[in-house]
Amino acid sequence: GALEVQVPEDPVVALVGTDATLCCSFSPEPGFSLAQLNLIWQLTDTKQLVHSFAEGQDQGSAYANRTALFPDLLAQGNASLRLQRVRVADEGSFTCFVSIRDFGSAAVSLQVAAPYSKPSMTLEPNKDLRPGDTVTITCSSYQGYPEAEVFWQDGQGVPLTGNVTTSQMANEQGLFDVHSILRVVLGANGTYSCLVRNPVLQQDAHSSVTITPQRSPTGAVEVQVPEDPVVALVGTDATLRCSFSPEPGFSLAQLNLIWQLTDTKQLVHSFTEGRDQGSAYANRTALFPDLLAQGNASLRLQRVRVADEGSFTCFVSIRDFGSAAVSLQVAAPYSKPSMTLEPNKDLRPGDTVTITCSSYRGYPEAEVFWQDGQGVPLTGNVTTSQMANEQGLFDVHSVLRVVLGANGTYSCLVRNPVLQQDAHGSVTITGQPMTFPPEA
């Protein structure tokens, strides 16, 4: 008969830039050897070869050298494929073909996602506003995938649907920048909120602007930065937003713009003497030169590292002087936990087993929760350790010691507190003598 190949029913959701595991398994017969295995991963639609194992050896990646098998697990029937540094273009269906004597196949869907940045809000005009003025509020959120849903509401939570224009443009990597424009007539004062929703991640990013019509005070330069920390994934680029309102007649030669680390006063980037003086921070920063004249003093920080986390101060001088600090919160998603059992054979009710849940390369430190099959939290006999690697990313290992009942399911949830990302794994142990992982 046909070989039974098992893959997850639901799409595998992977964040851009992270690694994804496309799970595929089969049940080897007694006496199975890897020399008998013929394993092919293909793109379902185009039939393009992705990775193969044949003639007793891994034939390697045929997909931009970004795929790998799990060679130590193949003999147990684990034909899963690791796809590294996921891109938008990877989205779609992958088919896992397994032949030993018989043949079987199954397709697994990869859904790519990228969180949208906290929206930045701009106002035009942004000075000397009075009740009755018509203003254009622009809500911009960047580098997300797939296309976002955008919602506006006023300070009372009433949806604003009229006079809204939303555009979404994909960059070279396929990530979308969303710009939504609301035109509104000012009342005495008002709060306007914009919510950008990622439909796959069910991630909502929102910002609001409160407008109190009045004359702007003169004197110090008003420097505006986001109130909330800017959250950036390790390895991606982050924009630290900073803006000011240039006076009529402003020229870039008048601008003195300094970005510093708030605590150490270390210079990060500067624009002085009419020109960009460049990055003083490992050549990983850039301004937006075409936008400076409009008052956009934002800083682009490339290839974010854990060590970048902290507060950055934007100092702006034209004639007057102003400054504001913006916080960078670095994050990295935790991998789907792997579960191991010790002992893992001939288990019987009453045995004490150690279940280890391991999740890798996340930041900041994770929160780990255990529960049984009924959803009851398990807090006793849990030991969790987290260790940072050279890049500052954490590997988390949580160990649960439990006495087996007739049967039971044990779930481990690893939560990234910044991304509000939950990664979970579970193991089900049945009452009869068994081996883990199950052979059928």
Partner: antibody, heavy 116, light 107 residues
Framework: QVQLQESGPGLVQPSGTLSLTCAVS?????????WTWVRQSPGQGLEWIGE???????SYSPSLRSRVTISVDKSKTQFSLKLSSVTAADTAVYYC?????????WGQGTLVTVSS | EIVMTQSPATLSVSPGERATLSCRAS??????LAWYQQKPGQAPRLLIY???TRATGIPDRFSGSGSGTEFTLTISSLESEDFAVYYC?????????FGQGTRLEIK
Amino acid sequence: QVQLQESGPGLVQPSGTLSLTCAVSGGSDSSTNWWTWVRQSPGQGLEWIGEISPIGFTSYSPSLRSRVTISVDKSKTQFSLKLSSVTAADTAVYYCARDRLYFAFWGQGTLVTVSS
Amino acid sequence: EIVMTQSPATLSVSPGERATLSCRASQSVSSNLAWYQQKPGQAPRLLIYGASTRATGIPDRFSGSGSGTEFTLTISSLESEDFAVYYCQQYNNWPITFGQGTRLEIK
């Protein structure tokens, strides 16, 4: 009312270093104000020398950049100018001023002569 | 750098009359121009900034006009204390530069 007062030696040897201090009084805060030096050669026009920001960041005239240093001492509410390798061409009245771009508050100026 | 040229070098006008001083920039400085008055033994005094905005405490007989490369300082009715040297200064491009001055003397 903001007051600025320059002080320093009136005579400097050629190839020596000119050092001037500007004392600030009357409520100007060095943590929010820029400070500027301007000079005026005898019978000549005004020349902008350089400026220092509230966080100690400096910009200098291209023609003087290699020889000039401006610094600020916040605790003493004063800022200073150093000009090295001076020649007779550096003989001038040196003014300190508050702010940048254009200047509403000036010191009364101090004449520095470069001569042996 | 931008060169500021003032004309005339010396202007002789009688008290009570109007004086018109000119300043030309070697390239556009938008409206980023200031005018100063300097008397012997004194520091310059800011009169006008933004080409036409009077500084605090400056009498309204002083007015500035122009944009781009051509600017004018007008003193509508000269008083005795107005006889001095006048400088224009641009702050549109780096570095800041001053004109060579116009001496306003009593006719």
